[in-house]
Each structure stands twice: as structure tokens, then as C-alpha cells.
Interface confidence: low
């Protein structure tokens, strides 16, 4: 009779993470008598996966009933595969011995490769807001994928970016891999509604890439422009001065009116108008009783936007041009001075 051979017909098996791997093994003879064991790896450090004779292997089931006396199919199934299960599995026949069984013959081995999907890309931006024309960095991370081959692209509002650097770790063999990419984006005033997208393509995704996004509204600060103007008011001896605060983002804004350097009123912008580009406009007004002032009045609109140093714009009101018996305000002039 021909000597027993251990046949592992599959050189390699590819399984998706979470699925069940079937590792096939058959023997060509019932002799010699003795159990089968499965190992991952070879040599003295090999890991026991299944022992027909004894032990508890909760993730492993046999394909056929090994208690049948004439059974020669020693295939196993390993459930809930993870990338950590990757490796070469050997089906080994032992010969019954005393006191210990003796290894008789090994199969050629089956390489189990695990395909694991990358995690959803997480895009993070800078910790602090930046103003238009500044370059900011965004990072994108995705983990746990296998095999190592992966493609990452960056987009801003659908336009592909080219200024980025990507690393896949580790460099050598591993059960799973991570990707880390940093992209540089130049902010513009129109970026409040913009999105930065990191797109990851991998064999496990079957052509449907994963995307992570960051909204530039979380990153950008558009500082306001100020304009102080004087409006005619019908009421006698009163002048209405408005401060137009335009094109700012985010909404967090506090405005203070100063009369000759003294605080007159403080307001917080809330009911603002929104521009198409996502920035805001706001208007505050101050009603000045000219008759209460003997001398010219310097009115200052001071704006603190998003915790930044205040910017201001002033307007000189010529009291001499406002005789108490007239409501005229024609001589008031706007100096347009810009103070920081």
C-alpha cells in the first residue's frame, strides 16, 4: 500500500474580515493510525490551531465527522476571521505513539490572506481658525485594512488637490495597515461653504470608495469690513449713525459704540443677514442727540470678531453745524479713519 500523503489542495485562500475561512486537507490513507493537528506557521514557534485528539477550539469546526473510522477529510473552518489570522496553515498527520504521538507527515501549507476594509477616513483640520490666503493643513487617517495596497485622494469642492503627503504603515509585512495623509489647502474668502474630502479606494470596497469630509466653515475666519455712515434723521437735533459690518464669518461678533472714547453701547450680532458665500452682514445704529454735546463728537464703531483684536472705524460729527434750533445735519463728516 502506498505511503500516506497529506494533501492541502489550496495554495492560498483569500477571506474577508468577519467571514469564515475553509482550510481543506485530505489524507490518502487510513494508515498509520493517529490524529491530525492544524498549525499556523512552521518550526518550533508554530501555533496550534486545532487538535483532533484533545483541547477546546471555539472558533474551529471540522467539515466532516472526524469520529468516523474511515474518515480521511480533515478540513476545518475558522469563524469570524480577522487580519490577525493571516498566515500559512499546515495540516499535520501524527502517528500514534507511546507516550506521545509522533509527527508523521505535513501538508504543503495553505496561505490564508485576510482582506479587511479600511475604517471610515477621519479628516481633521487645524485647531485654530485661519483667515483667507493662509495655508492650512488637513489630516486624513484610515486604519485596519489589508492587503497593503490602497489609494488616497484629496478634493476641495470636487476639485482634486495635489499638495499632499501620504504614508502607509507599517512598511513591512503586517496583519493590517494604516494610512495617514496630510494635505495643504489655501483658504479663500469664498470657502465658508467649502468642503475638503479625503477619498480612500481599496480592493475590499469593490469600487465604492470611502470618504471623510471636513467643512471649511470650522476652519475659516473671514474678518469683517466696517463702514460708518451718517443717516438723515427727521427728529430735531438727532443724528443716526450706522455701522455696516460686512462679509464676516463666523457669526461670533461683538460691537461697541464709543462717543469720544467712552463706551455708549455694546451689542452682540445675532440676527444677521447671510450672503450667498456663507459670510454675514450686520448693521448697528446709534442715535446721537447733538444738543447734548457742546463740542464735536468722535463716534467709533469697534468690532471684536471671534475673539480677535478689535478693529474700529470712526466718524467725526461736527456739533457746530447743528444749531439747537435746527435739525440740519449736512455738515457732519465721515473721517473714515481705520483704527486697530
Amino acid at each position: 500500500e502506498e505511503e500516506l500523503q497529506v494533501i492541502q489542495p489550496d495554495k492560498s485562500v483569500l477571506v474577508a474580515a468577519g467571514e469564515t475561512a475553509t482550510l481543506r486537507c485530505t489524507a490518502t490513507s487510513l494508515i498509520p493510525v493517529g490524529p491530525i493537528q492544524w498549525f499556523r506557521g512552521a518550526g518550533p514557534g508554530r501555533e496550534l490551531i486545532y487538535n483532533q485528539k484533545e483541547g477546546h477550539f471555539p472558533r474551529v469546526t471540522t467539515v466532516s465527522d472526524l469520529t468516523k473510522r474511515n474518515n480521511m477529510d480533515f478540513s476545518i473552518r475558522i469563524g469570524n476571521i480577522t487580519p490577525a489570522d493571516a498566515g500559512t496553515y499546515y495540516c499535520v498527520k501524527f502517528r500514534k505513539g507511546s507516550p506521545d504521538d509522533v509527527e508523521f507527515k505535513s501538508g504543503a501549507g495553505t496561505e490564508l490572506s485576510v482582506r479587511a476594509k479600511p475604517s471610515a477616513p477621519v479628516v481633521s483640520g487645524p485647531a485654530a481658525r485661519a483667515t483667507p490666503q493662509h495655508t492650512v493643513s488637513f489630516t486624513c487617517e484610515s486604519h485596519g485594512f489589508s492587503p497593503r495596497d490602497i489609494t488616497l485622494k484629496w478634493f476641495k469642492n470636487g476639485n482634486e488637490l495635489s499638495d499632499f503627503q501620504t504614508n502607509v504603515d507599517p512598511v513591512g509585512e503586517s496583519v493590517s495597515y494604516s494610512i495617514h495623509s496630510t494635505a495643504k489647502v489655501v483658504l479663500t474668502r469664498e470657502d465658508v461653504h467649502s468642503q475638503v474630502i479625503c477619498e480612500v479606494a481599496h480592493v475590499t470596497l469593490q469600487g465604492d470608495p470611502l470618504r471623510g469630509t471636513a467643512n471649511l466653515s470650522e476652519t475659516i475666519r473671514v474678518p469683517p469690513t466696517l463702514e460708518v455712515t451718517q443717516q438723515p434723521v427727521r427728529a430735531e437735533n438727532q443724528v443716526n449713525v450706522t455701522c455696516q459690518v460686512r462679509k464676516f464669518y463666523p457669526q461670533r461678533l461683538q460691537l461697541t459704540w464709543l462717543e469720544n472714547g467712552n463706551v455708549s453701547r455694546t451689542e452682540t450680532a445675532s440676527t444677521v443677514t447671510e450672503n450667498k458665500d456663507g459670510t454675514y452682514n450686520w448693521m448697528s445704529w446709534l442715535l446721537v442727540n447733538v444738543s447734548a454735546h457742546r463740542d464735536d463728537v468722535k463716534l467709533t464703531c469697534q468690532v471684536e470678531h471671534d475673539g480677535q483684536p478689535a478693529v474700529s472705524k470712526s466718524h467725526d460729527l461736527k456739533v457746530s453745524a447743528h444749531p439747537k434750533e435746527q435739525g440740519s445735519n449736512t455738515a457732519a463728516e465721515n473721517t473714515g479713519s481705520n483704527e486697530r
Epitope: P250, Q251, R252, S270, T271, D306
Partner: antibody
Framework: QIQLVQSGSELKKPGASVKVSCKAS????????MNWVRQAPGQGLEWMGF????????TYAQGFKGRFVFSLDTSVSTAYLQISSLKAEDTAVYYC????????????????WGQGTLVTVSS | DIQMTQSPSSLSASVGDRVTITCRAS??????LAWYQQKPGKSPKALIF???YRYIGVPSRFSGSGSGTDFTLTISNLQPEDFATYYC?????????FGQGTKLEIK
């Protein structure tokens, strides 16, 4: 001026359905998320969730998944709350309230509220 | 979920008084906190956002302070129209959550 105007009070029997409307005016409804807040008689305020008025995507708080549906008709600037299989414990005033969105520092503060719709469920 | 605890649950005060309502979050919410006023049979009215900023039209006698987990709403020089129920609300984390309310009554 900005207003959120809700539909009138409803008296319903257990098991029935109700649809509450919230019409936005004075601003573009698609610029602000629309939230729904419940206030049971004599109780405090409870956030039910919101609908992204730009994408139409709803987000429901944990206790409001299943029988509660948020929807939107941008052509008439109106958000809707539908409750099915009504129970006595659904008796409450339901408010719509707008928020700026969820990326800004004041993102989840409700700056404007509807007047509320009382839904009474009784057999 | 983040629990918001207001204290006291109710308080009595007189016109002209200064009152303080506190709100404690079960975890850090930064400055993502708002305050609302509600009168019987009416919808809530927004008073304060981002812990300290008054909405336009809210009288300056209302002021907010705090960050992290501890916040206060202070009403100085109480007016007759200020007697109402006040709620705090965090918007740092979903789900958005409110305090149980503080009822301010006339003494």
C-alpha cells in the same frame, strides 16, 4: 421679520396619526437646520432631533426613533413632524425651532421658535 | 447623554432684586451653552448663546457666565416681565439636552 408659524392644536385618539407643520418666513428655510422640541404638560423641554433642511436628512434623538418622522417641503418653506400610532404619553406641546447648523460656535442654540402645537391624545 | 442640572428649581424674588440661576453639566461642554426664558402658555425665548452672548433685543440686565461644566445666568434689577421659567441647554454633544428649568416667582 423671521417667523416660525405652526399648525393649530390637535385632538387625536390613541393609535391615530398626526402631522404638525412649521412654516418659516423671513429667511431661507434651507439655510438653517429645523429642530423639534417636545414639552409634556407641566414638564421641561426635550429635544427630539432635527432635519438638515439643505439635504433633507433627519436625525432623531434616542427616544424618538420609529413613530416620529421629520420631513420638509422647501417649495412652501415648511417643515413637518408626523407621529404615528399615537399614545396618551405623546400628549404635549411640540415646538419647531431653528438652529444655525452644527459647525459654528452657536450651532445648536435655538434662536427662533414656533408658537407650539398642542397635541392631545385621548380616547 | 449629558445631564444638565439647574439650581434652584424655583426661587422667589422682588422687583429690583438681583438673582442668579446656576446650571451644571455632567461633562465638559466648553461654552456651548444657551439660556431661554419661557412664560406660561408661550414658546421659549432665546436669551444667551455661547454661554455669555446676549441675543439682540435682550436687555442688558441679563448676563451669562461660565465654561466647562458650571454656568450662571444673572438677572440684575428684576423687572415684572422677568418672572418666568428659565432653561439652560447644552449643544456641545448630541443629543442636545436641557436643564429641568428654574421657576422665578414674585415674592
Amino acid at each position: 421679520q423671521i417667523q416660525l408659524v405652526q399648525s393649530g392644536s390637535e385632538l387625536k385618539k390613541p393609535g391615530a396619526s398626526v402631522k404638525v407643520s412649521c412654516k418659516a418666513s423671513g429667511y431661507s428655510i434651507t439655510d438653517y437646520a429645523m429642530n423639534w422640541v417636545r414639552q409634556a404638560p407641566g414638564q421641561g423641554l426635550e429635544w427630539m432631533g432635527f432635519i438638515n433642511t439643505y439635504t433633507g436628512e433627519p436625525t432623531y434623538a434616542q427616544g424618538f426613533k420609529g413613530r416620529f418622522v421629520f420631513s420638509l417641503d422647501t417649495s412652501v418653506s415648511t417643515a413637518y413632524l408626523q407621529i404615528s400610532s399615537l399614545k396618551a404619553e405623546d400628549t404635549a406641546v411640540y415646538y419647531c425651532a431653528r438652529t444655525r447648523g452644527y459647525y459654528d460656535f452657536d450651532g445648536g442654540a435655538f434662536d427662533y421658535w414656533g408658537q407650539g402645537t398642542l397635541v392631545t391624545v385621548s380616547s | 447623554d449629558i445631564q444638565m442640572t439647574q439650581s434652584p428649581s424655583s426661587l422667589s424674588a422682588s422687583v429690583g432684586d438681583r438673582v442668579t440661576i446656576t446650571c451644571r453639566a455632567s461633562q465638559n461642554v466648553g461654552t456651548h451653552l444657551a439660556w431661554y426664558q419661557q412664560k406660561p402658555g408661550k414658546s421659549p425665548k432665546a436669551l444667551i448663546f455661547s454661554a455669555i452672548y446676549r441675543y439682540i433685543g435682550v436687555p442688558s440686565r441679563f448676563s451669562g457666565s461660565g465654561s466647562g461644566t458650571d454656568f450662571t445666568l444673572t438677572i440684575s434689577n428684576l423687572q415684572p416681565e422677568d418672572f418666568a421659567t428659565y432653561y439652560c441647554q447644552q449643544y456641545n454633544t448630541y443629543p442636545l439636552t436641557f436643564g429641568q428649568g428654574t421657576k422665578l416667582e414674585i415674592k
